[in-house]
């Protein structure tokens, strides 16, 4: 027979000190093999795979078919205990001497072999007729995961023998496998919450709790779905799961009512150019609903402006937008608003921002180029272009001079300050054409280049040139 019992001790020699199954002479001491994984028999002493106790007769293959059947002894079929208790149970089998080939006993649970460090031990009790083997299995502080059907397996003469199952049922307080989840809902709109808990023991009954008060007077069998017809303000829901062992309460979840977002904060100007402003902001509270997009509102801050507001829409993330197509050297007021599925937030506080000066929009005028042969320099003169206020303060000019002769091409640029409207450039190549173009520079950038003015640099003293104020592209005037 088999036994099962609960125990409080944890020492191995105490674990397995209970009564042993029958047919064991009192004067025989058992020998044991503790297990870390599979059960193994002790090393053979007479060439057989179980311990020698008497000389076993040789059995032919024909005779082996006539051997009496061997089976595991009956044992306890069902063990019920509470969580965190200790349990032990066993399988036992009597093998006559007539059997030569036996393998160790292995433990299985729910169809899978229990490998690894389990608390199992096998004891052998030899006598004149054969050997009794007891496989003991223990679990300390059982958990729900230890629930299941345990059984033993053993190979005898190449035939697999399986014991009756021992069903271990660990009972405890209800265990939640699905708890209600926090959701954000539209005001006065129905929604569902789900709660599911299991034993054993079953059944498990569910009570719903809203803001510390029970919602249902009669319990519902698990799983339970609560349909809430709608809320007008935030509420906290939880569920109670009851079984014969007691009560477990789920986590409390907040059900939030979706509202419009709070206005964005910390609106900052990250960068300004002549015609664009890069603005950033920190989104306000999203109102329990994801922000969908944002609107950047821009109005001219100058008193003379007509007060019209430009609106630029952008995605809610990143919290960054480059406002483009603005006027140079202008002042703007900027605010941001964002929306979720409920609606638009109020606008952020307005902030002031300015665009920088732009690049000049016109080129210098009346460009003339003379060759000063005695000093071997080009004398370049021009008149200041009409620069608008928003083009910014003139800082100077960029002069591009390209030198071309047979087999030579040289492109150079120089910058001169705004103080004068003339420059002197050393002659780079003789017997060549020099093409001069000039652009005005402000802090906002470089303006367009003037039409090219060409001058022919002679080999020695002969000069071909003409000043030109509005030449055609590539034109060479001669003097």
């Amino acid at each position: 027979g088999g036994t099962a019992e609960k125990w409080e001790e944890t020492e191995l020699d105490q674990l397995f000190s209970g009564p042993l199954p029958g047919r064991l002479p009192v004067n025989h001491r058992p020998f044991s093999a503790p297990h870390s994984s599979r059960d193994q028999l002790p090393p053979p002493q007479t060439g057989r795979s179980h311990p020698a106790h008497t000389a076993a007769p040789q059995v032919t293959s024909t005779a082996s078919k006539l051997l009496p059947p061997v089976a595991f002894n009956h044992t306890i079929g069902h063990i019920v205990l509470s969580e965190h208790k200790n349990v032990k149970f066993n399988c036992s089998i009597n093998i006559p001497n007539t059997y030569q080939e036996t393998a160790g006993i292995s433990w299985w649970k729910d169809g899978k072999e229990l490998l690894g460090a389990h608390h199992s031990i096998t004891q052998f009790y030899p006598d004149e007729e054969g050997v009794s083997i007891i496989a003991l299995f223990s679990i300390a502080s059982v958990q729900r995961s230890d629930n299941g059907s345990y059984f033993c397996k053993m190979k005898v003469n190449n035939r697999e023998i399986v014991s009756d199952p021992i069903y271990v049922e660990v009972q405890g307080l209800p265990y939640f496998i699905k708890q209600p989840e926090s959701v954000n809902v539209t005001r006065n709109t129905a929604f569902n919450l789900t709660c599911q808990a299991v034993g054993p023991p079953e059944p498990v009954n569910i009570f719903w709790v809203q803001n510390s008060s029970r919602v249902n007077e009669k319990p519902e069998r698990s799983p339970s779905v609560l349909t809430v017809p709608g809320l007008t303000e935030t509420a906290v829901f939880s569920c109670e799961a009851h079984n014969d062992k007691g009560l477990t309460v789920s986590k409390g979840v907040h059900i939030n009512i979706k509202v419009i977002p709070s206005p964005p904060t910390e609106v900052h100007i990250l960068n300004s150019t002549a015609h664009s402003i890069l603005v950033s902001w920190v989104p306000g509270f999203d109102g329990y609903s994801p922000l969908q997009n944002c609107s950047i509102q821009v109005k001219e801050a100058d008193r003379l402006s007509n007060g019209s507001v430009m609106v630029f829409n952008t995605s809610a993330s990143p919290h960054l937008y480059e406002i483009q197509q603005l006027q140079a050297l202008a002042n703007y007021s900027i605010a941001v608003s964002c929306r979720n599925e409920i609606g638009w937030s109020a606008v952020s506080p307005w902030i002031l921002a300015s665009t920088t000066e732009g690049a000049p929009s016109v080129a210098p005028l009346n460009i003339t180029v003379f060759l000063n042969e005695s000093n071997n320099i080009l004398d370049i003169r021009w008149t200041k272009p009409p620069i608008k206020r928003q083009d910014g303060e003139l800082v100077g000019y960029r002069i591009s001079h390209v030198w071309e002769s047979a087999g030579t091409y040289k492109e150079l640029s120089e910058e001169v300050s705004q103080n004068g409207s003339w420059a002197q450039i050393p002659v780079q190549i003789h017997n060549a054409t020099c093409t001069v173009r000039i652009a005005a520079i402000t802090k906002g950038g470089i303006g367009p280049f003037s039409e090219p003015v060409n001058i022919i640099i002679p080999e020695h003293s002969k000069v071909d040139y003409a000043p030109s104020s509005t030449p055609a592209p590539g034109n060479t005037d001669s003097m």
Epitope: V395, G396, L412, S413, E414, E415, K443
Partner: antibody, heavy 125, light 112 residues
């Protein structure tokens, strides 16, 4: 370590030309402007001109416009200053000095943070 | 061109004592970008100039904190809280606001 190594002293005759070099190391040559400063004996400093190797733009103090030419050799990270039609007034120590990178040499800034050891130019017959 | 004036040609100081060097510009050095491009250099005897301070008061790396720069508009000052032997040389102010960039005439700091 940023270094600006200038060529050795020069003794030249009036009316001649001179070309001084400034070999740089320890930084990316095209990411900074290069400037030249004149220091006459016992006198103060005078900005002569600057070169932006990034967009190959030069700019000169008008006192030297037409007589000075600034060039660079990007492959060797070397800057050059050529001065023509020399007179005794050009006798001085000439320094190369690193400026910051600006899209225009005319704009404010140009913090001269590293200087060469100087090249002494003597113009004498 | 902007004229930079350093009124003291020579300043005689005792080691360990404070020193103050002034610099005036003929125009305000405050640029439209809000920055003031006033810088200080030190040229020790027989050496090339070395930058000490830029943007009026920002110390270059490796410059001792006994140096401080101050001022705005057209009036600027370089102060040394306790002069040390290595501080001797000629101090130049120069401006990078108005093209072309111009230097002060220099103030020589010498031992009394």
């Amino acid at each position: 370590e940023v270094q600006l190594q200038q060529s050795g002293p020069e003794l030249v005759k009036p009316g001649a030309s001179v070309k001084i070099s400034c070999k740089t190391s320890g930084y990316t040559f095209t990411e900074y402007t290069m400037h030249w400063v004149k220091q006459s004996h016992g006198k103060s400093l005078e900005w002569l001109g600057g070169f932006n190797p990034n967009n190959v733009i030069t700019s000169y103090n008008q006192r030297f416009q037409g007589r000075a030419t600034l060039t660079v050799d990007k492959s060797s990270s070397t800057a050059y200053m050529e001065l023509r039609s020399l007179t005794s007034d050009d006798s001085a120590v000439y320094y190369c000095t690193r400026g910051d990178l600006l899209w225009s040499l005319l704009l404010p800034g140009n913090y001269f943070d590293y200087w060469g050891q100087g090249t002494t130019l003597t113009v004498s017959s | 061109d902007v004229v930079m004036t350093q009124s003291s040609l020579t300043l005689s100081v005792t080691i360990g004592q404070p020193a103050s060097i002034s610099c005036k510009s003929s125009q305000s050095l405050l640029d439209s970008d809000g920055k003031t491009y006033l810088n200080w250099l030190l040229q020790r005897p027989g050496q090339s100039p070395k930058r000490l301070i830029y943007l009026v008061s920002k110390l270059d790396s490796g410059v001792p904190d006994r140096f401080t720069g101050s001022g705005s508009g057209t009036d600027f000052t370089l102060k040394i809280s306790r002069v040390e032997a290595e501080d001797l040389g000629v101090y130049y102010c120069w401006q990078g606001t108005h093209f072309p960039w111009t230097f002060g005439g220099g103030t020589k700091l010498e031992i009394k």
